[in-house]
Amino acid sequence: MRTEAQVPALQPPEPGLEGAMGHRTLVLPWVLLTLCVTAGTPEVWVQVRMEATELSSFTIRCGFLGSGSISLVTVSWGGPNGAGGTTLAVLHPERGIRQWAPARQARWETQSSISLILEGSGASSPCANTTFCCKFASFPEGSWEACGSLPPSSDPGLSAPPTPAPILRADLAGILGVSGVLLFGCVYLLHLLRRHKHRPAPRLQPSRTSPQAPRARAWAPSQASQAALHVPYATINTSCRPATLDTAHPHGGPSWWASLPTHAAHRPQGPAAWASTPIPARGSFVSVENGLYAQAGERPPHTGPGLTLFPDPRGPRAMEGPLGVR
């Protein structure tokens, strides 16, 4: 999970001590430090809500707090990735949306958040202590997953606050994607810190700013998402598993919100903007070595295929390989 450190409140140096130049060189290391701590570590939040009108109906909302291009979202229930779960929906920004019962409708709310409506009765119906997980595959961050569930005492109609799940796995792609920039910055930071070793350290005081305080990020998440960042995370083991579904590896996917105007529905661009297959099968979304994509098989011990990403935006036939030949 991204460290919740924010830009420390720097006390200005004593008047006349260093002058304008010194002031800048003092601020720069701390900015770089914040970047080193926060950059490249996106976050996923999950919110589960039981509808007041239908007690068997749930709405799951998930969001990705990162600056990369989302290339796949997978929503599952029954546990986090690798812990045994069943895929409810897979959303791909270009190739579409697929959901499985009891999921009724999956959609994009924004370019980086999705919602899923579940409804059912009997064995396939979700219940209050079911754990729902969302996995976002993005470039360059890699795959990030979070889980959440309704608190046992939740009243219908109320929702658990968005849960910033600790990232279960920061895949290699995410690390490599930002390492170049960060390495340079951090080396420079160390250099600056070494230069300032002999000088009095600036006084720091804990940041008392709200979650809306600026972060080292190119854009600001919604207030709801931001407010969620300080909510403790807990995975509640589910005793309410769909009786009709065997255990499977959990995994999720993305889709565009139905009401988004076209001009707002910009699809993710970049090398990972489209997962061209080989295609994972439903049910398991296990990150492969490059940390970008995965496999999906419905139920263990089956494991699905590896999913390869290709940069060609023209689609499934735009590259060589199984999907590249017409």
């Epitope: 190739r95 579409g96 076209t262 295609i279 494991t303 699905g304």
Partner: antibody, heavy 119, light 107 residues
Framework: EVQLQQSGPELVKPGASVKISCKAS????????MSWVKQSHGKSLEWIGD????????SYNQKFKGKATLTVDKSSSTAYMELRSLTSEDSAVYYC????????????WGQGTSVTVSS | DIQMTQSPASLSASVGETVTITCRAS??????LAWYQQKQGKSPQLLVY???TLTEDVPSRFSGSGSGTQFSLKINSLQPEDFGSYYC?????????FGGGTKLELK
């Protein structure tokens, strides 16, 4: 080269059943769901359902539940569709099609199998 | 289920002409609309998905547009190999449904 080779044409009597096959080659069989599509003579396309080759899990169009049964044999990279209680309404060309993630587009198609139901 | 309505059902045109086929969805499908081309006696082939993304080897004279519920496929400067039937399909959840098809014939 990706190929989906379907079994030959079938002429069957009303009330009977028929099982048609679709053998996949040129890609990893478990990398795609196998969809089945019906095309009645001179008409449009209807999605029957699909099967996950990893475990045989199926999804059906409500219209074809009870009519079609989809299965796979991973060892031979072959998908099957059985149609039962056939009537003249079931006379059509049936296609298998490989669907890539998230399994809602038909990326590759078999050549089709013609099923004629006639007494 | 999402219903897909295509028009016109048939269309006659000459080589070199430009034609437009339309497809309407019964509910909002965002940009998740695909087009398939089927030549006489052959299997359908995926042509376009996500409204306007052309699959490999599809000539640039084909272009898709639209969003929400209204979509169209435009073919500029028709070539002999473009004649056949065209089907739209939403890829916004299941069941997958197709339009009734448009038969493009040589005038």
């Amino acid at each position: 080269e990706v190929q989906l080779q379907q079994s030959g044409p079938e002429l069957v009597k009303p009330g009977a059943s028929v099982k048609i096959s679709c053998k996949a080659s040129g890609y990893t069989f478990t990398d795609y769901y196998m969809s089945w599509v019906k095309q009645s003579h001179g008409k449009s396309l209807e999605w029957i359902g699909d099967v996950n080759p990893n475990n045989g899990d199926t999804s059906y169009n409500q219209k074809f539940k009870g009519k079609a049964t989809l299965t796979v044999d991973k060892s031979s990279s072959t998908a099957y569709m059985e149609l039962r209680s056939l009537t003249s309404e079931d006379s059509a060309v049936y296609y298998c099609a490989a669907s890539g993630l998230p399994y809602v587009l038909m990326d590759y198609w078999g050549q089709g199998t013609s099923v004629t139901v006639s007494s | 289920d999402i219903q897909m309505t295509q028009s016109p059902a048939s269309l006659s045109a000459s080589v070199g002409e430009t034609v437009t086929i339309t497809c309407r969805a019964s509910e909002n499908i965002n940009s998740y609309l695909a087009w398939y081309q089927q030549k006489q006696g052959k299997s359908p082939q995926l042509l376009v998905y996500n409204t306007k993304t052309l699959t490999e080897d599809v000539p640039s004279r084909f272009s898709g547009s639209g969003s929400g519920t209204q979509f169209s496929l435009k073919i500029n400067s028709l070539q002999p190999e473009d004649f056949g039937s065209y089907y739209c399909q939403h890829h916004y959840g299941t069941p997958l449904t197709f339009g009734g098809g448009t038969k493009l014939e040589l005038k």
